[in-house]
Structures are given as structure tokens and as C-alpha cells.
């Protein structure tokens, strides 16, 4: 945030730039939190946008029985390596097809015993607040999917007859590890010393760092035609003057005439 | 990449007797998977029989047991299938699949490599 200043009072202006601002030849060139000629107004929304999607991510051991283990399924670069996660990872968008938060899985680790597949099972949704209902259930739907699909392709006669075949108690849900994002948390933050002042707010699911001073929401405060302003002590109301009256009180709701007063004084002298 | 390139195909009597062969090239290993499937005209393709290279394992389906015989030359890199006692119901287009790992499985999504088939015909 800048304000740009000419003339002779701008050397003054230079040495006058409040809460960390630096002077770039022209303005204060503000920090985030901060505005106006000298940096010295506190900013009434903070941008906290979050991010447009939230990840999870679910560690999963599945025993391949269809496929016979050798040493070259150890190196990732080789071909051998290279065509079971071709596979794989078919089998398991057939099997996860269903789930819209679903992204694609990563093979970590292949091991003895038939063919053990350490791998990762990849998640995504929009951000809504409801985020981490969406992904706590789109984990649970992966869990019973993956336990379904290795129970039913199983091999018989020592043949499989699907795509890939597994072994029925070697499905294991090791972690699940959900990106974390706190609005409310960030916001604290972001605001500093004013941390206390600010709170979150949605609008259209997307949440909105604000001060009282942000007018248009709930905890907007209504300074008439006065000027909401941030202080280290909390939102105030700073009343204006006109041409005919003066206002006062905590949201600038009095006002007095000007001709009363002068009025009054005139009759006293 | 690996490549397949069947031959052998042709018209032959009931009872008769064929030999495929399937050349493959682009394999980095001499331990892979090899198979024949097989496509009559309306019908879903099936596997026939499969090999592994290294002799590990041989897989006939029920239906042509005792009639048809899978080898692999690993010094040829060829793949082939010794069909006889043919019936008028083997009649199908024959298509030679191959895999870098060694499968246990039947299924012809499982397998990434093919040829372009060749076409057998019993008939009288």
C-alpha cells in the first residue's frame, strides 16, 4: 500500500514513515498491515484467500499376488518397475473411480512377498469450510474400497482372472496426514498486535480477515459519519465535524449543532 | 518398446494342426511374460495359454489342454504355439501379449504389449 507525496515536504515525509515503512524516493512503501501518507492507518481486512484446493494424503500397504516378485521391481527406473506402476495405478483408478476427491496414487516402495506396494493414495478438494468433513469421508470411502476390491480379487488355483489380484490380510492404512489450514488461526497471526480485533468472516464460503472497520459484515462497526480507526486498544470512532455540527459518543450517533453552541456563548456574553 | 510381430496363421481342416510363432524385441531382460489370446468374431478375447521365459510357469486354459503347446526360444526371443487336433471352434483372430513382469493373471488388461494378430480358420 502507497501513497505517493510531491514537493518540498516529502524529505520531512521520509524520515516520518510510521510502523516500518521505508521511503522509496516518493512514498512510504507500507508493510502489509499498515497504510496511508505515513504508513499510520492499520489496514480493516487482511488477505488470508485460501488456498483453492486442500490435499490429503493416505500411506497404504496392498499385497499384489497376480505378480511374481523379482530384484528389478526394487529400481524405480527400471521397465519391469515402470509397467507394474502402469498397472497399478489403472487398477486403482478403477477402483477409486468413484471418489471425486480422488487423484491418483504413488508407489513408495515395492517389496518380497509376492509383490508388497507401499504406496500413497492422493486427495484433493475445493476449499469450503466443510473441507475436513469432505476429506474424513472421502477416507473412509478409500478404506472401504480398497479392503472391497482386495477381498473380491483374490486368485483361485493359483490364477488371477481380474487385472490384478491381492492378498485379502495384506491391506493396511498406515497414516493419513490432511494439510491443515486454519483461517482463524492465520488471521491471529497476520494481524499482529491487533490479533485480538481481528476475526474471520465468510462470504461465499471464503473467509475474510477483518476489523470492525471493514464495514459490510456482521461485526462492522457503525461509526455514522464518522471514521472507523484501529488502535493497539481496539476499534474507535474518530467524529468528524461540518460546517454545522460536531459529533460525538462511541459510534458518533450525537451531534450538536453548531448554532446552538455559539448560540449559547453569544448569550452569555 | 517392446514390439510383437505374429505369424502362422492360415485355413486348416478339422483335426489339423498349425504352429504361431510371435518375434519380440525392445525387452531389456530375459525374464518376462508371454501369452497367446485368442478373439472369435462377437466374442470377448480369452486367454489361451501363457508362459514365463525363464520356465518358471506354463498356464493352458481348459479348452485347449492336451490339444496346445506354448514354447518360448529365449536365443530367438520368439514365442510360439503348436496347435493341433484343431476344431472348428478355435476359429478366431490370435494375438500374442507380453509383459516385462512375470503375471499370473488371465486378464488381457493386465497385459500392456500386442501384436497385431494373426487369423485361424477350421474348416472343412
Known amino acids: 500500500r502507497t501513497t505517493t507525496c510531491f514537493g518540498d515536504g516529502c524529505q520531512n515525509t521520509a524520515s516520518r514513515c510510521k510502523n516500518g515503512g521505508t521511503w522509496d524516493g516518493l512514498k512510504c512503501q507500507c508493510p502489509n498491515l499498515y497504510y496511508g501518507e505515513l504508513c499510520e492507518e492499520v489496514v480493516s481486512s487482511i488477505d488470508i484467500g485460501p488456498p483453492e484446493t486442500i490435499s490429503a494424503q493416505m500411506e497404504l500397504t496392498v499385497t499384489v499376488t497376480s505378480v511374481k516378485f523379482t530384484e528389478e521391481l526394487k529400481n524405480h527406473s527400471s521397465q519391469e518397475f515402470q509397467e507394474f506402476k502402469q498397472t497399478f495405478t489403472e487398477q486403482m483408478n478403477i477402483v477409486y473411480s468413484g471418489i471425486p476427491e480422488y487423484v491418483g496414487v504413488n508407489i513408495t516402495k515395492l517389496r518380497l512377498g509376492s509383490v508388497v506396494v507401499e504406496h500413497d493414495v492422493l486427495l484433493r478438494t475445493k476449499y469450503t469450510p466443510e473441507y475436513k468433513t469432505v476429506l474424513d469421508n472421502a477416507t473412509e470411502v478409500v478404506k472401504e474400497k480398497i479392503t472391497k476390491v482386495t477381498t473380491q480379487q483374490i486368485m483361485i488355483n493359483d490364477i488371477c482372472s481380474d487385472m490384478m489380484c491381492f492378498n485379502t490380510t495384506g491391506t493396511q492404512v498406515q497414516n493419513i496426514t490432511v494439510t491443515q489450514y486454519d483461517p482463524e488461526e492465520d488471521c491471529r497471526k497476520m494481524a499482529k498486535e491487533y490479533g485480538d480485533y481481528f476475526v474471520v468472516e465468510y462470504r461465499d464460503q471464503k473467509p475474510y480477515c477483518i476489523s470492525p472497520c471493514e464495514p459490510g459484515f456482521s461485526v462492522s462497526k457503525n461509526c455514522n459519519l464518522g471514521k472507523c480507526q484501529m488502535s493497539l486498544s481496539g476499534p474507535q470512532c474518530l467524529c468528524v465535524t461540518t460546517e454545522t455540527h460536531w459529533y460525538s459518543g462511541e459510534t458518533c450517533n450525537q451531534g450538536t449543532q453548531k448554532s446552538l453552541v455559539y448560540g449559547h456563548h453569544h448569550h452569555h456574553h | 518398446e517392446v514390439q510383437l510381430v505374429e505369424s502362422g496363421g492360415g485355413v486348416v481342416q478339422p483335426g489339423g494342426s498349425l504352429r504361431l510363432s510371435c518375434a519380440a524385441s525392445?525387452?531389456?531382460?530375459?525374464?518376462?511374460?508371454m501369452a497367446w489370446f485368442r478373439q472369435a468374431p462377437g466374442k470377448e478375447r480369452e486367454v489361451v495359454a501363457f508362459?514365463?521365459?525363464?520356465?518358471?510357469?506354463?498356464y493352458y486354459a481348459d479348452s485347449v489342454k492336451g490339444r496346445f503347446t506354448i514354447s518360448h526360444d529365449n536365443s530367438k526371443n520368439t514365442l510360439y504355439l503348436q496347435m493341433n487336433s484343431l476344431r472348428a471352434e478355435d476359429t478366431a483372430v490370435y494375438y500374442c501379449?507380453?509383459?516385462?513382469?512375470?503375471?499370473?493373471?488371465?486378464?488381457?488388461?493386465?497385459?500392456?504389449?500386442w501384436g497385431q494378430g494373426t487369423m485361424v480358420t477350421v474348416s472343412s
Open positions: 501379449a507380453a509383459s516385462s513382469l512375470l503375471l499370473q493373471t488371465i486378464n488381457p488388461r493386465a497385459w500392456p504389449y
Open positions: 525392445g525387452y531389456t531382460s530375459n525374464r518376462y511374460s
Open positions: 508362459i514365463w521365459t525363464d520356465g518358471g510357469r506354463t
